[in-house]
Interface confidence: low
Amino acid sequence: GELETSDVVTVVLGQDAKLPCFYRGDSGEQVGQVAWARADAGEGAQELALLHSKYGLHVSPAYEGRVEQPPPPRNPLDGSVLLRNAVQADEGEYECRVSTFPAGSFQARLRLRVLVPPLPSLNPGPALEEGQGLTLAASCTAEGSPAPSVTWDTEVKGTTSSRSFKHSRSAAVTSEFHLVPSRSMNGQPLTCVVSHPGLLQDQRITHILHVSFLAEASVRGLEDQNLWHVGREGAMLKCLSEGQPPPSYNWTRLDGPLPSGVRVDGDTLGFPPLTTEHSGIYVCHVSNEFSSRDSQVTVDVLDPQEDSGKQVDLVSAS
């Protein structure tokens, strides 16, 4: 006869491991007892359990409550056992010794592999700012047994680097994603994908990118200078910029205080009916936590009376 077993039995942490050991004998042969032992090199054989054809299952104290026979119906030639709730410390070599009558004793070894699925964590890097060089966007760490695979799923251009740390029974893998920050990356997802034989499906953790920036400022409202004439109502200047975080706006006049009646409403400067007093250099100051920008414009309010006088001069001069 011969023993049938597996070279390797693989289970996920916490699952029950079936350690197979089946005696395939000739007719009339009987199994008297089956002894299971831990057989790691360097450690003395540690008894797990003894299955006796007459006296049933005896489990050694170290494995009390953790070793059982598979549920019935059971074949009398089957010496398989269930190791309940496998933990990392159970990983290793096991030996099954079968005493048969009349053929004698047989033994076989198998390796129990306990997969420890990772519980990944994603850590964002330092604050991203436009203008930085290659910067750490995020790192993703997963520890398991065997070592998990850590990759990135994103539309963003970047470079990855991975490193591994081996522990006695597991390995931690850390992958870093570096990029050159630009404003177009704002709101883009960066997903860490962890694969492992103990996971039913990949684990995914998503981080949304935030890149600080501040665009150049510009002022709208002076496109048609002819509209800026004495008496005109509803004249306004609007400061244009964008940024992350959203910027705040401040208006000043370079050549003195803002004229009375001029209203500041965030990015907009609203004028009362125009007078020549409103002529001057206006500055829009845009800022956020990242940076600040200025844009200045010269407002020249036309007085039609003066213009007509000039016009007459011009005409007479011609």
Epitope: L13, G14, N85, V87, Q88, A89, V116, P117, P118, L119, S121, T141, E143, H167, R169, S170, A172, L200, Q201, Q203, R204, I205
Partner: antibody, heavy 117, light 107 residues
Framework: QVQLVQSGSELKKPGASVKVSCKAS????????IHWVRQAPGQGLEWIGW????????KYNERFKGRVTITADKSTNTAYMELSSLRSEDTAVYYC??????????WGQGTSVTVSS | DIQMTQSPSTLSASVGDRVTITCRAS??????VAWYQQKPGKAPKLLMY???NRFTGVPDRFSGSGYGTDFTLTISSLQAEDVAVYFC?????????FGQGTKLEIK
């Protein structure tokens, strides 16, 4: 058998800190995660964070970041959860639970923390 | 954060009845869902994990199913000792979140 035994009830004043312990036995402490979960009176369950004693990695719920610290002492198979700057809404029963690896399969008996002036 | 919405919040049934509790996730959580039973003044106890796996020692009248966003816990024949609050939990992405609970009573 697997057991998680937590420290006794606590009465604290607002602004104080509390440190709850969870002693594990019956399994290899460094091979499993320990999670902390709380339950306010008559309310549901809220996850606080976890620690993996094998390498002392931690992960916290953003809601508690900056106020919570989870630690583990491998020599005594004990995990700890410390919550600072306590306020009345932190009054709850705090549970530790072993996870296997994502599922909390065994729970401590709970520690009642009352925050009152 | 992923929201887990349980229904109903209270359920009254007779001994021997078939009882179903549902849980809906605000986004797909694959099958990373666990169900817990909590009796008054006690810690929660794990019933099901990975949506459909019965935990050690849990009677086979309890079963679970679902994938993605919709999950159910079924008790095929309600017993008096099943009176408790039942919670679902997603273990797909932190922060790990729980349903608000379903209180099961006997009529």
């Amino acid at each position: 058998q697997v057991q998680l035994v937590q420290s006794g009830s606590e009465l604290k004043k607002p602004g104080a800190s509390v440190k709850v312990s969870c002693k594990a036995s019956g399994y290899t402490f460094t091979s499993y995660y320990i999670h902390w979960v709380r339950q306010a009176p008559g309310q549901g369950l809220e996850w606080i964070g976890w620690i993996y004693p094998g390498n002392v990695n931690t992960k916290y719920n953003e809601r508690f970041k900056g106020r919570v610290t989870i630690t583990a002492d491998k020599s005594t198979n004990t995990a700890y959860m410390e919550l600072s700057s306590l306020r009345s809404e932190d009054t709850a029963v705090y549970y530790c639970a072993r996870s296997n690896p994502y599922v909390m399969d065994y729970w401590g008996q709970g520690t009642s923390v009352t925050v009152s002036s | 954060d992923i929201q887990m919405t349980q229904s109903p919040s209270t359920l009254s049934a007779s001994v021997g009845d078939r009882v179903t509790i549902t849980c809906r996730a605000s986004q797909s959580v694959n099958n990373d869902v666990a169900w817990y039973q909590q009796k008054p003044g006690k810690a929660p106890k794990l019933l099901m994990y990975y949506a459909s796996n019965r935990f050690t020692g849990v009677p086979d009248r309890f079963s679970g199913s679902g994938y993605g966003t919709d999950f159910t816990l079924t008790i095929s024949s309600l017993q008096a000792e099943d009176v408790a609050v039942y919670f679902c939990q997603q273990a797909y992405r932190s922060p790990y979140t729980f349903g608000q609970g379903t209180k099961l009573e006997i009529k």
